[in-house]
Amino acid sequence: WELTILHTNDVHSRLEQTSEDSSKCVNASRCMGGVARLFTKVQQIRRAEPNVLLLDAGDQYQGTIWFTVYKGAEVAHFMNALRYDAMALGNHEFDNGVEGLIEPLLKEAKFPILSANIKAKGPLASQISGLYLPYKVLPVGDEVVGIVGYTSKETPFLSNPGTNLVFEDEITALQPEVDKLKTLNVNKIIALGHSGFETDKLIAQKVRGVDVVVGGHSNTFLYTGNPPSKEVPAGKYPFIVTSDDGRKVPVVQAYAFGKYLGYLKIEFDERGNVISSHGNPILLNSSIPEDPSIKADINKWRIKLDNYSTQELGKTIVYLDGSSQSCRFRECNMGNLICDAMINNNLRHADEMFWNHVSMCILNGGGIRSPIDERNNGTITWENLAAVLPFGGTFDLVQLKGSTLKKAFEHSVHRYGQSTGEFLQVGGIHVVYDLSRKPGDRVVKLDVLCTKCRVPSYDPLKMDEIYKVILPNFLANGGDGFQMIKDELLRHDSGDQDINVVSTYISKMKVIYPAVEGRIK
């Protein structure tokens, strides 16, 4: 018996087609992805093959103005239109709190939404009861398939799930659900979830009875053969893990941003064992036409976005200096504003010992592309912010050793004076450079804001200590020559859309007046 699994993950509100790098589509003939194009391909496969499941492994939320405006209603609407069979909850589904998940998505989705390792407690337990499930058994052709969901247990540090959801260890939570399905004669089981490729592989290895793992969170690109675009494969598709009980378990992921549709064919024997698995992600490029009815619906929903981008978010009473002449050479108040917004967006998980889990921000000056003039009545709009941050990136959370941070700051000024983009703007950091010294030895003082303290203060950076830092995904991926970050980071979790972070902060503050205050000397 053969099953076709079509899968997406980390779509991050790319409802419209995008450019090859998943930013805003400029030249339509070269654009990719989007739900209208995805629908064309899905329907083509559904017509051609008998037993097809369309699955999403989480993080539909967050990433473009679509999410900022529609807050998840767009996800439910278009996933319903595409007739997804199931979705696992990702960490970003909690970005607007539990209410921001329940109302627009859980109550409106016409497909099961899954997570076996999220347990509700207190008053939320009855409110959320039945709105998401640990698993769902689906009839597919003449057989039944069990789909068990899971979500990153780091979600409380990455999003806003509140205090009434407990995120258990994925493997511990999955095993009893899989065991239960086995006793009920469900012998074909897919683990669908959002914890990253390393955890996906562990689930394949450790959870007895799981036949296939469909994952997300780490934006992993797997491919067998010559890859069709710019993404470099992290391994073959499917990636085969030998389980502790000796089975070969295929693990798949489909990069991110709706650029690819994962396509996996699994052959099962009559006892539900995987005999063979093969496939590849399908690049959703312009050779696949956009479905006209979905495209028309997208255009209808688009109208509200255009109106939103010119509305006032808040006011500035000072010039927001985002000029390259400032931000690539010295501390600039636009850099300070953005870093303050980045930290503010990550205020969570205070306890008796920590005022926050993260206090530091770094931001490449080259990523700041425009100033905002306060003389336009002080008005700041989404459109203004899109000029400052035009690349459609995210502000991510990484863990780095102090020694890596020191290297990053040396890199920041290794060729100072040439108006290059690697000059770092900061938050929660005081850095002093001596530019008379030779490159690689110019950082003379590097103090960082404590987190394990009731009164935050600046302490000298410790080379062997592990620090959490918020930074643009561009830097986490080694951009602007920050290879040491990419090579040495100990953990990387993708965060929220850059413009959204700053716009939320400005809306919250209402009036802003960031200063140059001696963070960089």
Partner: antibody
Framework: QVQMKQSAAEVRKPGASVKVSCKAS????????MDWVRQAPGQGLEWMGD????????IYNQKFKGRVTMTIDTSRSTAYMELRSLRSDDTAVYYC???????????WGQGTTVTVSS | DIQMTQSPSFLSASVGDRVTITCKAS??????LSWYQQKPGKAPKTLIY???RLIDGVPSRFSGSGSGTDFTLTISSLQYEDMATYYC?????????FGGGTKLEIK
């Protein structure tokens, strides 16, 4: 509005077969599975099976396996349930019911009475 | 197969009463439970699915609750037209199984 119209009552002798039809309207036929449920006189409801109109895939209750066949004709938006080797205890009202996205039955046909008597 | 035990099997109540019918599954059914109303000589009518979601057009006096193995159908203020037999169904796994029914009579 969603409607399921079933075929008329049938009388059969033991050992014979019966084929009940269920014509759906008011929705896209291939978007929802169809379940079949029966109810013997004065008794409760009993689930018989499920069919996917997209591909004809069926899941049967083991109790009826080998005796029941569910089919579809998408061009007519009609589902069929055939029960073979009829016995007197197969005398019942047979219902078709559409399932919603959650695979819960939501709209029901009016029922077809099948009487098995020698 | 999962067994569904409904109670009571017979219930007599007055118009305006709050009425509760319970359904117990032989094991956790993951909120995959629906409730049906059947009047004599008629086809069943779906009231609730996923334990607590009301089907469009069903009066709001009907509500469902519960999770795991224990589920409840509540009629907040009984009306004459609610006289019927009520069934629960688990659709968590195959085969789907119904409860034995609760016959509700108006005093």
């Amino acid at each position: 509005q969603v409607q399921m119209k079933q075929s008329a009552a049938e009388v059969r002798k033991p050992g014979a077969s019966v084929k009940v039809s269920c014509k759906a309207s008011g929705y896209t036929f291939t978007d929802s599975n169809m379940d079949w449920v029966r109810q013997a006189p004065g008794q409760g409801l009993e689930w018989m099976g499920d069919i996917n109109p997209n591909n004809g895939g069926t899941i049967y209750n083991q109790k009826f396996k080998g005796r029941v066949t569910m089919t579809i004709d998408t061009s007519r938006s009609t589902a069929y349930m055939e029960l073979r080797s009829l016995r007197s205890d197969d005398t019942a009202v047979y219902y078709c019911a559409r399932t919603n996205w959650d695979y819960a039955m939501d709209y029901w046909g009016q029922g077809t009475t099948v009487t098995v008597s020698s | 197969d999962i067994q569904m035990t409904q109670s009571p099997s017979f219930l007599s109540a007055s118009v305006g009463d709050r009425v509760t019918i319970t359904c117990k599954a032989s094991q956790d059914i993951n909120s995959q439970l629906s409730w049906y109303q059947q009047k004599p000589g008629k086809a069943p009518k779906t009231l609730i699915y996923r334990a607590n979601r009301l089907i469009d057009g069903v009066p709001s006096r009907f509500s469902g609750s519960g999770s795991g193995t224990d589920f409840t159908l509540t009629i907040s203020s009984l009306q004459y037209e609610d006289m019927a037999t009520y069934y629960c169904l688990q659709y968590d796994v195959f085969p789907r199984t119904f409860g034995g029914g609760t016959k509700l009579e108006i005093k």
